[in-house]
């Protein structure tokens, strides 16, 4: 499932190249393993900002598919309470390109520990 999430992220990256979306998104670029579930939830919410601002059906569908995959993959450890992690609003705001790159990194963390 996480491997498919990466495929969707690559697809989103390709789709947004032809668009002008100047949104900045809360991005965790240095995820601590003990905060990865919290960080993932932030990434999943911020991803929907891209969908909200693009108005593009392909982006909507890809974002939604990614969220389905990620939430289902998260469900086994999504209820774990991680303490001492940053709230989404405390993260740095980055452009979409940097956001997607950091998103790929956190997904790889999940792949490596599954």
């Amino acid at each position: 499932n996480w491997v498919n999430v990466i495929s969707d992220l690559k697809k989103i990256e390709d789709l947004i190249q032809s668009m002008h979306i100047d949104a900045t998104l809360y991005t965790e670029s240095d995820v601590h393993p003990s905060c990865k579930v919290t960080a993932m939830k932030c990434f999943l919410l911020e991803l929907q900002v891209i969908s909200l601002e693009s108005g593009d059906a392909s982006i909507h569908d890809t974002v939604e598919n990614l969220i389905i995959l990620a939430n289902n993959s998260l469900s086994s450890n999504g209820n774990v309470t991680e303490s001492g992690c940053k709230e989404c609003e405390e993260l740095e705001e980055k452009n979409i390109k940097e956001f997607l790159q950091s998103f790929v990194h956190i997904v790889q963390m999940f792949i490596n520990t599954s």
């Epitope: 932030c42 919410l45 969220i67 389905i68 939430n71 989404c88």
Partner: antibody
């Protein structure tokens, strides 16, 4: 396109309960949340609470905590809001709205879009 | 209980620029985003501005949001008759974990 269709108008007696439904289409219902908001005649908007259709987590506004129950049925992509011990000042249009939050920590950065058409609930003896 | 204060009414003529304010207490608006919803007569509200100043796709750039200190504003330039509606600001109260709406502003477009 994303659409939320609500159940029809209700007339209830004081002390009774009402259950409003909100059927979603055009998106994966079980991956997101639903917020409920009401509007008394000629008044402003008031948030009642949120439910995650993904995991059933709920967060109710303090004011309604002991009278409201929100549920979802993912097999029919429908959200429900039940309000008990109705009083005349509960007379309002009740709206459901798609909320991007599937997890509680996402709620503080969420938004409500789109909204259902509203359900008029009249409480009168 | 946190409160967001909006003027009950505002008006302007077609083509004009109008501003609707939304003010909160010192502690709230400064560190929380403001959202704006438009409610046309007899219809459900619609998301207009989110996170202080961002527009969802499909919302004309005549609508803009801003925030300074404890006050947020919605500006509508090139006013049109179809902008006649109620406008609500909202924010998330992190202490209560609840969404709070302003009282709403009824915008009238004078012909």
């Amino acid at each position: 396109q994303v659409q939320l269709v609500q159940s029809g108008a209700e007339v209830k007696k004081p002390g009774a309960s009402v259950k409003v439904s909100c059927k979603a289409s055009g998106y994966s219902f079980s991956s997101f949340g639903i917020s409920w908001v009401r509007q008394a005649p000629g008044q402003g908007l008031e948030w009642l609470g949120w439910i995650s259709a993904f995991n059933g987590y709920t967060k109710y506004a303090q004011k309604f905590q002991d009278r409201v129950t929100m549920t979802t049925d993912t097999s029919t992509s429908t959200a429900y809001m039940e309000l008990r011990s109705l009083r005349s000042d509960d007379t309002a249009v009740y709206y459901c709205a798609r909320d991007p939050a599937a997890w509680p920590l996402q709620q503080s950065l969420a938004w409500f879009d789109p909204w259902g058409q509203g359900t008029m609930v009249t409480v009168s003896s | 209980q946190s409160v967001l204060t909006q003027p009950p009414s505002a008006s302007g003529t077609p083509g004009q620029r109008v501003t609707i304010s939304c003010s909160g207490s010192t502690s709230n608006l400064k560190r929380n985003y403001v959202y704006w919803y438009q409610q046309l007569p007899g219809t459900a509200p619609k998301l207009l501005i989110y996170r202080d100043r961002r527009r969802p796709s499909g919302v004309p750039d005549r609508f803009s949001g801003s925030k300074s200190g404890t006050s947020a504003s919605l500006a509508i330039s090139g006013l049109r008759s179809e902008d006649e509606a109620d406008y609500y600001c909202a924010w998330y109260d992190r202490e209560l974990s609840e969404w709070v709406f302003g009282g709403g502003t009824k915008l009238t477009v004078l012909q």
